[in-house]
């Protein structure tokens, strides 16, 4: 959570001379209360925007907009304090709009905007606009707060931002999963254009429980340049137990920009729906998961459909 670096912070508009200042989040009107204080903002609108820093990085920013109520209290409005709280870390950042001239009623509702709070992907923020001066201790509150959840790096708008690109958001591995004979699962994915290792993680669950019944990790060594954008294949030997059939596959890259904290892509292969016609007689504890058919699974179409629902984990 920070302010966009190089922009001149402007809040003046026709009919109002205004300056933006850094704030400690503790306006002195709390220490020296005033008798007459303005009412609260009428509406706050927050949306996501993308801005460039002076170093040319694209960063997600909050675009905050609010309007004033059309009452006489605007005659006592001396400014506003904008506060953004990042929920998970309790970090707070504030700026103050300081009005250098008195507000007057005009034909349109007064409207203010600010788009300089740089935020993180997949984080939740509380945005508060506090009109100044703040009210006396028992006075009616003159602030309004709204929450905003910044989308994760899967979101189209976020994908191109520098923090998301640094964690590998542009890489689409297009994972496919195929069940083979002899309790095997073949995972294929597209390599990115970097000579960096990958890890493929398989975790299997029973259909009815959340408990893992099998897991294994396979390493893929850093590809050579001529292998960039090619498909890589990994074959896993699965658990022998027929009930351990719900598979979760993750592909973890180790790109230089994010090391062991890169976005992972995952696919889930559900347990097959077993119909009476396809189930052979049980042998001991094991019912085959598939009928062999020239080296591919009866459920291959389902797997392929499933693989199109891949998603990021951060």
């Amino acid at each position: 959570l920070r302010l966009l670096d190089h922009r001149a912070l402007v809040c003046s508009q026709p009919g109002l001379n205004c300056t933006v200042k850094n704030s400690t989040c503790l306006d002195d009107s709390w220490i020296h209360p005033r008798n007459l204080t303005p009412s609260s903002p009428k509406n706050i609108y927050i949306n996501l925007s993308v801005s460039s820093t002076q170093h040319g990085e694209l960063v997600p920013v909050l675009h905050v907009e609010w309007t004033l109520q059309t009452d006489a209290s605007i005659l006592y409005l001396e400014g506003a304090e904008l506060s953004v709280l990042q929920l998970n870390t309790n970090e707070r950042l504030c700026v103050r709009f300081e009005f250098l001239s008195k507000l007057r009623h005009h034909h349109r509702r007064w409207r203010f905007t600010f788009s300089h709070f740089v935020v993180d992907p997949d984080q939740e923020y509380e945005v508060t606009v506090h009109h100044l001066p703040k009210p006396i201790p028992d006075g009616d509150p003159n602030h309004q707060s709204k929450n905003f959840l910044v989308p994760d790096c899967e979101h189209a708008r976020m994908k191109v931002t520098t923090p998301c690109m640094s964690s590998g958001s542009l890489w689409d591995p297009n994972i496919t999963v195929e069940t083979l004979e002899a309790h095997q699962l073949r995972v294929s994915f597209t390599l990115w254009n970097e000579s960096t290792p990958y890890q493929v993680l398989l975790e299997s669950f029973s259909d009815s429980e959340n408990h893992s019944c099998f897991d294994v990790v396979k390493q893929i060594f850093a590809p050579r340049q001529e292998e960039f954008h090619q498909r890589a294949n990994v074959t896993f030997t699965l658990s022998k137990f027929h009930w351990c059939c719900h598979h979760h596959v993750q592909v973890q890259p180790f790109f230089s920009s994010c090391l062991n904290d890169c976005l992972r892509h995952a696919v889930t292969v559900p347990c097959p729906v077993i119909s009476n016609t396809t189930v052979p007689k049980p042998v001991a504890d094991y019912i085959p998961l598939w009928e062999p058919r020239s080296g591919s699974s009866d459920y291959k179409d389902d797997d392929d459909k499933g693989s199109s629902h891949h998603h990021h984990h951060h």
């Epitope: 929920l87 508060t128 602030h143």
Partner: antibody, heavy 118, light 107 residues
Framework: EVQLVESGGGSVQPGGSLRLSCAAS????????MNWVRQAPGKGLEWVSI????????HYADSVKGRFTISRDNAKNSLYLQMNSLRDEDTAVYYC???????????WGQGTTVTVSS | DIQMTQSPSSLSASVGDRVTITCRAS??????LAWYQQKPGKFPELLIY???TLQSGVPSRFSGSGSGTDFTLTISSLQPEDVATYYC?????????FGPGTKVDIK
């Protein structure tokens, strides 16, 4: 001195209600999100709920969703947890905890004990 | 929701030993991880936040490392007063789940 003091615990029958309070002092309460965390006897810590400084963001653990309500009164420097439809498994020590700037929870109360039993 | 696991669930070590506790998240959580120490009958105390930053007042024999899904708490030289249960907690997004805990005692 930064301090959190919980109160309102006690014994209640299954299906009953209790309201826990947490009184904060020694810091600007209205600047902080606040959490409730609980610990069943002999068990580990379980995060229960969080409320942001201006109450615009509230989250609950799945185990209490729809039964517990977190709230706060910044003018009174107080945090609350209204617990309805209590179950045996809600028996625990309930702590209020303040998040640290940067992450984690650095200030905890001493806890208040809730016993749900018929 | 992201699951947190800890290993071992308990351990016994001698005074002066190096002790390592691991915490694993079922999905990546960047460095949004905290470690706590809880002594019997007491409230938890924050040891480490942001995966590796030592909380003020915590002895330097405690250290944290890791990012993404795998994290480690290390006590470089175990002391008698370190007998406690240690919990990790993820705080990237709600719910802010704790790990099941690791009980540490002296041999």
């Amino acid at each position: 001195e930064v301090q959190l003091v919980e109160s309102g615990g006690g014994s209640v029958q299954p299906g009953g209600s209790l309201r826990l309070s947490c009184a904060a002092s020694g810091f600007t309460f209205s600047s902080y999100s606040m959490n409730w965390v609980r610990q069943a006897p002999g068990k580990g810590l379980e995060w229960v709920s969080i409320i942001s400084s201006r109450s615009s963001i509230i989250h609950y653990a799945d185990s209490v969703k729809g039964r517990f309500t977190i709230s706060r009164d910044n003018a009174k420097n107080s945090l609350y947890l209204q617990m309805n439809s209590l179950r045996d498994e809600d028996t625990a020590v309930y702590y209020c905890a303040r998040p640290k700037v940067g992450g984690g929870m650095d200030v905890w109360g001493q806890g208040t004990t809730v016993t749900v039993s018929s | 929701d992201i699951q947190m696991t800890q290993s071992p669930s308990s351990l016994s070590a001698s005074v002066g030993d190096r002790v390592t506790i691991t915490c694993r998240a079922s999905q990546g959580i960047s460095n949004y991880l905290a470690w706590y120490q809880q002594k019997p009958g007491k409230f938890p105390e924050l040891l480490i936040y942001a995966a590796s930053t030592l909380q003020s007042g915590v002895p330097s024999r405690f250290s944290g490392s890791g990012s993404g899904t795998d994290f480690t708490l290390t006590i470089s030289s175990l002391q008698p007063e370190d007998v406690a249960t240690y919990y990790c907690q993820k705080y990237n997004r709600a719910p802010f789940t704790f790990g099941p805990g690791t009980k540490v005692d002296i041999k």
